[in-house]
């Protein structure tokens, strides 16, 4: 299995729709897999970050993403001292919401890309594909994606470099 | 030691406008996202605006948007905070804050809407 | 509108132990809301506590703790003081809006 997430970078502002797009490509399918959408909260704030960039937590991060490139404090972080939740799963056509998002418009669709018809407080965070075959075991199952969600439209682009901003309309 | 001392506080009429500033001492002022946080008479905090360490960024509370202004002037190591159109119900201690976590806060200073 | 709800008043003996919510009007608290906790006492300028749910500032003494407990945010006082009776807030990150609760007055009998 292949799961790549195309845009891993969202912003969008309250109350606005998002998809969180996700695909997913198999060396064999003789079965359809399962589509596992996961949350977990930001390992640290990205709009303080962004806000106060001389703060000593942001200085000790600058040294370790010096010390190794790829790695990301805001989603690399043990998953006791954050919030896990499942948003959405789906197998063949069914798609199941975790029991946080009962009642919300939040579906699974396309090949696996994760839609909220309308975000809110307490969707920001990262945002895990993962895709599971008996039949399929190797290659990398899982991606991710970042989402904020804003209560203002006003300097995404400034505060958050490298996010992609969503509808900005009120 | 971080000191953080507003200024600018009074009494104004109705309608009338008022700065308030924030002079900071103690750390790099260019460096860090700022808040100014209110508190009424026997009431409890209620947060007002922040802006970024080099002023790109603000965030109003609904209360005060399209009346206040947050800005700073890195240069002097001072934070501001312009109110127009004021109300009644901006009679208030205004506290202004280092940091997002707000680690730090001011004495305050009194700002009493009155006719 | 968003609502943070804290108890409006806790009484506690001294060197007991008191634990202060923290809900929110839009759902659960999680850590990605930040939760931030601030102490005043009267006549005095409001001081920091806990940020990030549970990070204590240098200065914060150790019998304060902040964690997740439920679908809140809970401020913990283990061995209670007679100088930690003072007024006690909550504060929530909404995606560039911050909300404050209404605060705890905690009592310190005796």
């Known amino acids: 299995i292949q799961v790549t997430v195309s845009d891993p970078y969202h912003v969008v502002i309250l109350f606005q729709p998002v998809t969180l797009p996700c695909t997913y490509q198999m060396t064999s399918t003789p079965t359809q897999p399962i589509v596992i959408w996961k949350y977990k909260s930001f390992c640290r704030d990205r709009i303080a970050d962004a806000f106060s960039p001389a703060s000593v937590d942001n200085q000790l991060n600058a040294q370790l993403v010096a010390g190794n490139p790829g790695y990301n404090p805001y989603v690399e972080c043990q998953d006791s001292v954050r919030t896990v939740r499942v948003v959405a799963t789906k197998q063949g056509n069914a798609v199941t919401l975790g029991d946080y998002y009962q009642g919300r418009r939040i579906t699974i669709t396309g090949n696996a890309d994760l839609t909220f018809d309308e975000t809110a407080w307490g969707d920001s965070g990262v945002y895990y594909c993962s895709v599971v075959s008996a039949q399929d075991l190797e290659g990398n199952n899982e991606a991710y994606a970042e989402l904020i969600v804003l209560g203002r439209t006003s300097g995404v682009a400034e505060l958050l470099p490298g996010f992609q901003a969503g509808p900005m309309e009120d | 030691e971080v000191q953080l001392v507003e200024s600018g506080g009074g009494v104004v009429q109705p309608g009338r406008s008022l700065r308030l500033s924030c002079a900071a001492s103690?750390?790099?002022?260019?460096?860090?996202?700022m808040h100014w946080v209110r508190q009424a008479p026997g009431k409890g905090l209620e947060w007002v605006a922040v802006?970024?360490?080099?002023?790109?960024?603000?965030y109003y509370a609904d209360s005060v948007k399209g009346r206040f202004t947050i800005s700073r002037d890195n240069s002097k190591n001072t934070l501001y905070l312009q109110m127009n159109s004021l109300r009644a119900e901006d009679t208030a201690v205004y506290y202004c804050a280092k940091d997002l976590n707000m680690d730090y806060w001011g004495q305050g200073t009194l700002v009493t809407v009155s006719s | 509108q968003t609502v943070v709800t804290q108890e409006p008043s806790l009484t506690v003996s001294p060197g007991g132990t008191v634990t202060l919510t923290c809900a929110s009007s839009t759902g659960a608290v999680t850590s990605g809301y930040y939760p931030t906790w601030i102490q005043q006492k009267p006549g005095q300028a409001p001081r920091a506590l806990i940020h990030t749910t549970s990070y204590k500032h240098s200065w914060t003494p150790a019998r304060f703790s902040g964690s997740l407990v439920g679908d809140k945010a809970a401020l913990t006082l283990s061995g209670v003081q007679p100088e930690d009776e003072a007024e006690y807030y909550c504060l929530l990150q909404y995606g560039g809006a911050w909300v404050f609760g209404g605060g705890t007055k905690v009592t310190v009998l005796g």
């Open positions: 103690g750390f790099t002022f260019s460096s860090y996202g």
């Open positions: 802006i970024s360490y080099d002023g790109s960024n603000k």
